[in-house]
């Protein structure tokens, strides 16, 4: 049953002289393994004999017996599945059919297998793309359909006969479904290899010529062109004559349409190989070139700068930066159109030429208020001088100077006035938009500048405004001067440290905290009545008439003040005492009688002692000394001692009369 | 304790004549060496001494207001007086009386009025 065998290798292998062939095979006899092997070189069937005839190549027997002239076939396969040969060398006679007679314990079949042998290395074949175009990468691939083990070749790749710089990559196949060398390169080609040679190379191992194919490169590009100028360097006056001339060094396809362009821009009406431009003004001045197109695209010549030479025209100054700060730096740029460009410039400031200043830049490193106004330059070249242009304005911007606080009241100025001040000064860019005052205070500001201080304070002493554009400029601080009647007058003890007593020496000090001005005069009042005119009131011998309230005065050209009322307390002993009778010193007896002892001390009298004409204290010790009933024995002289913290003061001798009653009288 | 107090008119026209009163209590302005002074605040401004009369009677004034200030004593009242002539709005003040050992504008409550605002307008 033929349906049981499967074979899969390639129809037909190519190989040369001296070369080898590997055939790889595989199959699949369904019926169990392979018995019986042989390989014939063109076999045909006998049907007499019902058997293959032919030059048998290769034989496997069942005792697996190989005639030893087999050696150059090599059967490399197995009993089921593998079924590759190997021939090496091969030779040019083997060309032809190889079949294969397999056998098994009940199936036979004949596998035929074509064999190419040249005489000769056969060449590899070279593909190109359909087209190829300048600058875009293609592969180029060289196929031979030849590979074996036993036998290494390679594939090297020539341009003009040159080995080609790129890298290829060479791929070999011996699989059933192909067996191949393939060499791949990848190429830009430029317009330059249009027409040129591309070889692939056969080689052996050792790098020996074998074959090659090749090619004739077909690069389409767009036209290639070269510009010529009269003159050669293209430099020119206003009125001369140029002319240019485009030629095509190559072109595939052939071009179709020419043209001319200026910096980029088509000329119009200008489609020949010849451009001529007659009385050049410096408006033409640019770069030329000529384009020329073909299908792939257009082509672009090298650009010719046409340099139309002319004076310097009139110029413009650059500033960098106006508006520009004080101390800043400045740097200022004259333009001008000119070629060949300025050699030489004057540069002007108001109008007026700055001298040294001959460059095409001028740098002030610091730059000050009177750097400002207008800034104009001419430039010169070998052609002319040009013309000075409108200029540019630097405006110098700084902060205010020479700023002032000014008082405006007239001097002096006296505590509760209004006091107005104005910000002065001399020059401010931009212009002052706003002040500052220090100190702070809930002050007016009728008008900008102006600061008004109502019911001003003894104690303002300076005041500084600021005068501020974007930066703020301080003025040095202005006195006030307030003047003001004395303050916080008050009087002081000088002496004694403690309490005052009769008899003490005493100092009374006038004081103050300030005065404005300074010169001062004194005054001490006692109820109304002027003491005296120092700061001082002094007192040899304190009496208690001394005692009472104290104010002192101190005056200026501004006003007076007095002091609070001051007591002066003098402390003394009981002075003064005397013993007075109630009703009387004469009394009946039976009646009451009150002895009061009076006296003038400060402090008061804290304790009393009564004594009898006998000098004989009483145990009583209140102010009054009441006798109830008052006898005849009372009769007799009393005094009284008054004590306080300071001493004791007596009094003299007060007699007291008792006489009888009618009663005692009638009785006797 | 001393006290003194102005009155008279709030509201005066131009060129017209201003006259104050000062009543002095708690001591007599015949006696002692006291000075019995009349002085103003203008709106916005300092003190200003006008003019003083004397325990013994005699008058002193500012050299500022001389021409135009009279200053009298009715001791049975215990009174004295300001008359400012010819008023202009810039006498627009608040006017005190004070007292005063030399003559002053006197600073301290104790010894002068409350004092009394006078306006100037027509």
């Known amino acids: 049953d033929s349906s049981k065998w499967v074979f899969e290798h390639p129809e037909t292998l190519y190989a040369w002289e001296g070369a080898c062939v590997w055939i790889p095979c595989t199959y699949r006899a369904l019926d169990g393994d392979l018995e019986s092997f042989i390989l014939f070189h063109n076999p045909e069937y006998n049907k007499n004999t019902s058997k293959f005839d032919g030059t048998r190549l290769y034989e496997s027997t069942k005792d697996g017996k190989v005639p030893s002239e087999q050696k150059r076939v090599q059967f490399l396969g197995d009993k089921n599945k593998n079924c590759t040969l190997s021939i090496h060398p091969v030779h040019l006679n083997d060309s032809g059919q190889l079949g294969l007679r397999m056998e098994s314990k009940t199936e036979k079949w004949m596998e035929r297998i074509h064999l190419n042998v040249s005489e000769r290395p056969f060449p590899p074949h070279i593909q190109l793309p359909p087209e190829i175009q300048e600058s875009q990468e293609v592969t180029l691939t060289c196929l031979l359909n030849f590979s074996c083990y036993g036998y290494p070749i390679q594939l090297q790749w020539l341009l003009e006969g040159v080995p080609m710089r790129q890298a290829a990559v060479t791929s070999t196949s011996l699989t059933i479904k192909s067996v191949f060398t393939r060499s791949e390169l990848k190429f830009s080609p430029q317009w330059s290899h249009h027409g040129k040679i591309v070889t692939c190379q056969l080689q052996d191992a050792d790098g020996k010529f074998l074959s090659n194919d090749t090619v004739q490169l077909n690069v389409k590009h767009t036209p290639k062109l070269e510009i010529k100028v009269t003159p050669s360097d293209a430099i020119v006056r206003e009125g001369d004559s140029v002319t240019m001339t485009c030629e095509v060094s190559s072109s595939n396809p052939e071009y179709t349409t020419v043209s001319w362009l200026k910096d980029g821009t088509s000329l119009k009406k200008q489609n020949t190989f010849t451009l001529n431009l007659r009385e050049v003004t410096k408006d033409q001045s640019g770069k030329y070139c000529c384009q020329v197109s073909n299908d792939v695209g257009p082509g672009r010549s090298e650009e010719v700068f046409l340099q139309v030479q002319y004076a310097p025209e009139p110029s413009t100054v650059q500033i960098l930066h106006s508006p520009a700060v004080e101390g800043s730096q400045v740097e200022f740029l004259c333009m001008s159109l000119a070629n060949p460009l300025p050699t030489n410039y004057t540069w002007y400031h108001n109008g007026k030429e700055m001298q040294g200043r001959t460059e095409e830049k001028v740098h002030i490193p610091k730059i000050l208020p009177w750097h400002a106004g207008t800034y104009s330059c001419v430039a010169e070249n070998i052609l002319g001088t040009g013309q000075r242009g409108p200029g540019a304005e630097l405006d110098v911007q700084y902060p205010p100077k020479k700023v002032t606080t000014v008082i405006q009241n007239p001097m002096p100025i006296r505590e509760g006035d209004t006091v107005t001040l104005s910000c002065n000064y001399n020059s401010s860019n931009p212009s002052v938009t706003r002040y500052e005052w220090k100190p702070h205070g809930a002050w007016e500001e009728p008008s900008l500048g102006v600061l008004k201080i109502q019911n001003v304070g003894w104690d303002n002493t300076t005041i500084a405004c600021a005068a501020c554009n974007s930066w703020c400029s301080w003025a040095s601080p202005v006195a006030l001067n307030v003047q003001y009647a004395p303050r916080d007058v008050r009087v002081r003890k000088i002496k004694p440290l403690s309490e005052i007593h009769s008899g003490n020496s005493v100092s009374l000090q006038c004081d103050f905290s300030s005065s404005h001005p300074k010169e001062v005069q004194f005054f001490w009042e006692k109820n109304g009545r002027l003491l005296g005119k120092e700061s001082q009131l002094n007192f040899d011998s304190i009496s208690p008439e001394d005692a009472g309230s104290y104010s002192c005065w101190v005056n200026n050209s501004i006003g007076q003040t007095a002091s609070k009322a001051w007591t002066l307390e003098v402390l003394y002993a009981p002075r003064r005492l005397r013993v007075s009778m109630s009703p009387g010193d004469q009394v009946m007896e039976g009646k009451s009688a009150t002895l009061t002892c009076e006296s003038d001390a400060n402090p008061p009298v804290s304790h009393y002692t009564w004594f009898d004409w006998n000098n004989q204290s009483l145990p009583y010790h209140s102010q009054k000394l009441r006798l109830e009933p008052v006898k005849v024995q009372h009769s007799g002289a009393y005094w009284c001692q008054g004590t306080n913290s300071v001493g004791k003061g007596r009094s003299p001798l007060s007699t007291l009369t008792v006489y009888y009653s009618p009663e005692t009288i009638g009785r006797r | 304790q001393v006290q003194l107090q102005e009155s008279g008119p709030g509201l005066v026209k131009p060129s017209q004549t201003l006259s104050l009163t000062c009543t002095v209590s708690?001591?007599?302005?015949?006696?002692?060496?006291?000075?019995w002074n009349w002085f103003r605040q203008p709106p916005g401004k300092g003190l200003e001494w006008m003019g003083a009369i004397a325990a013994s009677g005699s008058t002193t004034y500012s050299p500022s207001f001389e021409s135009r200030t009279s200053i009298s004593r009715d001791t049975s009242k215990n009174q004295f007086s300001l008359k400012l002539s010819s008023v202009t709005a810039a006498d627009t003040a608040v006017y005190y009386c004070?007292?005063?050992?030399?003559?002053?504008?006197?600073?301290?409550?104790?010894?002068r009025g409350q004092g009394t605002l006078v306006t100037v307008s027509s």
């Open positions: 708690g001591a007599s302005i015949t006696t002692g060496e006291f000075y």
């Open positions: 004070g007292r005063s050992f030399g003559v002053a504008a006197v600073t301290t409550g104790q010894n």
